[in-house]
Interface confidence: low
């Protein structure tokens, strides 16, 4: 099927932060369609052509001392500068997860089932979700979705446990997250009608 | 190569394309959109309320986009008019929270691997177009230099309604519909041995 012709140019000014601002790296990328053609890497200190298409630009920009000096200063003037702003805002953002458990099928004792622990609406991304059966951690039969980015500054993740419920069994989904003073634990009891948060 | 770091920011992502022609200017932090500049209205639109305390001069974005336009024209000539290759987008639909009938929720349609960044995302309810309660992100950048975009539909889940996220893109032979309907939790019954 014929589609319109399109030509795309991208420029990405990227800052990489490790251990606060102890290690900061600026990489500015010029991209034609999806091909990166020129890069300025603060670890290198000058423009480098990534492909032949970017050679004239790299040579020209390196010849312009004002452009080069501005780029060399950008790791401080852009990256570190903006990181101070992030420290006041995004890096302090904490949204507590909501945790619920649901079985994937109608429960029946001694019948194979899947318990789904839905951990939703949290920020930042790092999270630890574990399953326990009668206070013993379950590692076999645990399947997790990747971390899901909602695109609205929240994340979610679903962690499934394959199980065969026995009468009296207590299954616990245990969630640790930077927004929480102490972990969230939600219980699901074989024969009970609902999951309960402790 | 992907650079390993605790945090990655894009200050900013500048995009200009001949189709339209159109441009986009955003800042991203750890993969989320901080703001975009509405290039037509010449205003900065913040995507996270806490960031509204700060200022970003939209003129900076407009100047950058003008430079990109100039650079693109040079590259089209230099590349003997090598146009963008259409990629096949991947579409996933899921809810923001676990579904309870009658409880407000949000459907999320993730359109991944978008290139070039021209796409039409719409929502259907029982086959009919829905326009109310619909919003979407800007084109969000990826390390392979393709994009993704997320569309949202606020809804009140009911057993009678099913939904489709409809995606139109040049990489698709025909519009792609991803279906979603509420999974009504299995009724709780007395357990029998």
């Amino acid at each position: 099927r014929d589609s319109p012709e399109d030509f795309v140019y991208q420029f990405k000014g990227m800052c990489y932060f490790t251990n606060g601002t102890e290690r900061v790296r600026l990489v500015s990328r010029s991209i034609y369609n999806r091909e990166e053609i020129v890069r300025f890497d603060s670890d290198v200190g000058e423009f480098r052509a990534v492909t032949l298409l970017g050679l004239p630009a790299a040579e020209y920009w390196n010849s312009q001392k004002d452009i080069l000096e501005r780029k060399r200063a950008a790791v401080d003037r852009v990256c570190r500068h903006n990181y101070q702003l992030e420290l006041r805002t995004t890096l302090q953002r904490r949204v507590e997860p909501t945790v619920t458990i649901s079985p994937s099928r109608t429960e029946a004792l001694n019948h194979h089932n899947l318990l789904v622990c839905s951990v939703t609406d949290f920020y930042p991304a790092q999270i630890k979700v574990r399953w326990f059966r009668n206070d013993q951690e379950e590692t076999a039969g645990v399947v997790s979705t990747p971390l899901i980015r909602n695109g609205d500054w929240t994340f979610q993740i679903l962690v499934m446990l394959e199980m065969t419920p026995q009468r009296g069994d207590v299954y616990t989904c245990h969630v640790e997250h930077p927004s929480l003073q102490s972990p969230i634990t939600v219980e699901w009891r074989a024969q009970s009608e609902s999951a309960q948060s402790k | 190569e992907d650079i390993v770091a605790d945090h990655v920011a894009s200050y900013g992502v500048n995009l200009y394309q001949s189709y339209g022609p159109s441009g986009q200017y955003t800042h991203e932090f750890d993969g989320d959109e901080q703001f975009y500049v509405d290039l037509g209205r010449k205003e900065t639109v913040w995507c996270l309320p806490v960031l509204r305390q700060f200022r970003f001069d939209p003129q900076f974005a407009l100047t950058n986009i003008a430079v990109l336009k100039h650079n693109l024209n040079s590259l089209i000539k230099r590349s003997n008019s090598t146009a963008a290759t259409n990629e096949v987008p991947e579409v996933t639909v899921f809810s923001k929270s676990p579904v309870t009938l009658g409880q407000p929720n949000i459907l999320i349609c993730l359109v991944d691997n978008i290139f070039p960044p021209v796409v039409n995302i719409t929502w259907l309810s029982n086959g009919h177009s829905v326009t109310e309660g619909v919003s979407e992100t800007s084109f969000l950048s990826k390390s392979d230099h393709s994009f993704f975009k997320i569309s949202y539909l606020t809804l009140l889940p009911s057993a009678e309604e099913s939904y489709d996220c409809k995606v139109e893109h040049w990489g698709l032979d025909k519009p792609l519909l991803k279906h979603w309907e509420p999974e009504i939790p299995a009724p709780m019954s007395e357990l029998t041995e």
Partner: antibody, heavy 121, light 112 residues
Framework: QSLEESGGDLVKPGASLTLTCTAS?????????MCWVRQAPGKGLEWIAC????????TYYPSWAKGRFTISKTSSTTVTLQMTSLTAADTATYFC??????????????WGPGTLVTVSS | DIVMTQTPSSVSAAVGGTVTIKCQAS??????LAWYQQKPGQPPKLLIY???DLASGVPSRFSGSGSGTEFTLAISGVQCDDAATYYC??????????????FGGGTKVEIK
């Protein structure tokens, strides 16, 4: 755009006092950080407190000022500084200052003329 | 808290000469430094921000440099009107909602 401080006075040790900063030519509907800085006679500048005038109303103090000084936004054009348990060491000219907006780093780019507080028995 | 150490505490310069004032932060503040000029009976006036950017309306004979912990204010072609006390001011965010906004002790500049 200007700032003016008021409320400076001669007070006895142990007393409380409230200073007011009034903005002219702009209002806090555009959010700013508003601050108080003081200067003892013949001495240097000392930051006391700041408040973000947006909806969060976040306040910031150096460790020495916490508890005894309270900054508040009282209207769309006024910010106050409440001071308690005053001592002779608090004798100073108190400046109201607006922070330069829109930068990752913050500086004071608009100052009031100052108001004198004297603590003496 | 961050300490800003300013040197010298006073300096005398001839008209047309150059004055250099140094400011040292007790830990890195990157480019988070400003310089102010204060004349007797007046509030301070912002001269330089982000370590080296000139505030609007400030003559180009004033310049700032440095980053991290060491900063310098230079006044070249000193004029009589430059007689004043100059302060450096560091801005650092210490995490968990704590800011360190600290001034140096000041440098009094006299013109001969």
């Amino acid at each position: 755009q200007s700032l003016e401080e008021s409320g400076g006075d001669l007070v006895k040790p142990g007393a409380s006092l409230t200073l007011t900063c009034t903005a002219s030519g702009f209002s806090f509907s555009s959010s700013y950080y508003m601050c108080w800085v003081r200067q003892a006679p013949g001495k240097g500048l000392e930051w006391i407190a700041c408040i973000y005038t947006g909806s969060s109303g976040s306040t910031y103090y150096p460790s020495w000022a916490k508890g005894r000084f309270t900054i508040s936004k009282t209207s769309s054009t006024t910010v106050t500084l409440q001071m308690t348990s005053l001592t002779a060491a608090d004798t100073a000219t108190y400046f109201c200052a607006r922070v330069r907006a829109g930068s990752g780093y913050y500086y004071f780019n608009l100052w009031g003329p100052g108001t004198l507080v004297t603590v003496s028995s | 808290d961050i300490v800003m150490t300013q040197t010298p505490s006073s300096v005398s310069a001839a008209v047309g000469g150059t004055v250099t004032i140094k400011c040292q932060a007790s830990q890195t503040i990157y480019s988070g430094l400003a310089w102010y000029q204060q004349k007797p009976g007046q509030p301070p006036k912002l001269l330089i921000y982000d370590a080296s950017d000139l505030a609007s309306g400030v003559p180009s004979r004033f310049s700032g440099s440095g980053s991290g912990t060491e900063f310098t204010l230079a006044i070249s072609g000193v004029q009589c009107d430059d007689a004043a006390t100059y302060y450096c001011h560091g801005d650092y965010y210490g995490g968990s909602g704590t800011f360190f906004w600290t001034f140096g002790g000041g440098t009094k500049v006299e013109i001969k």
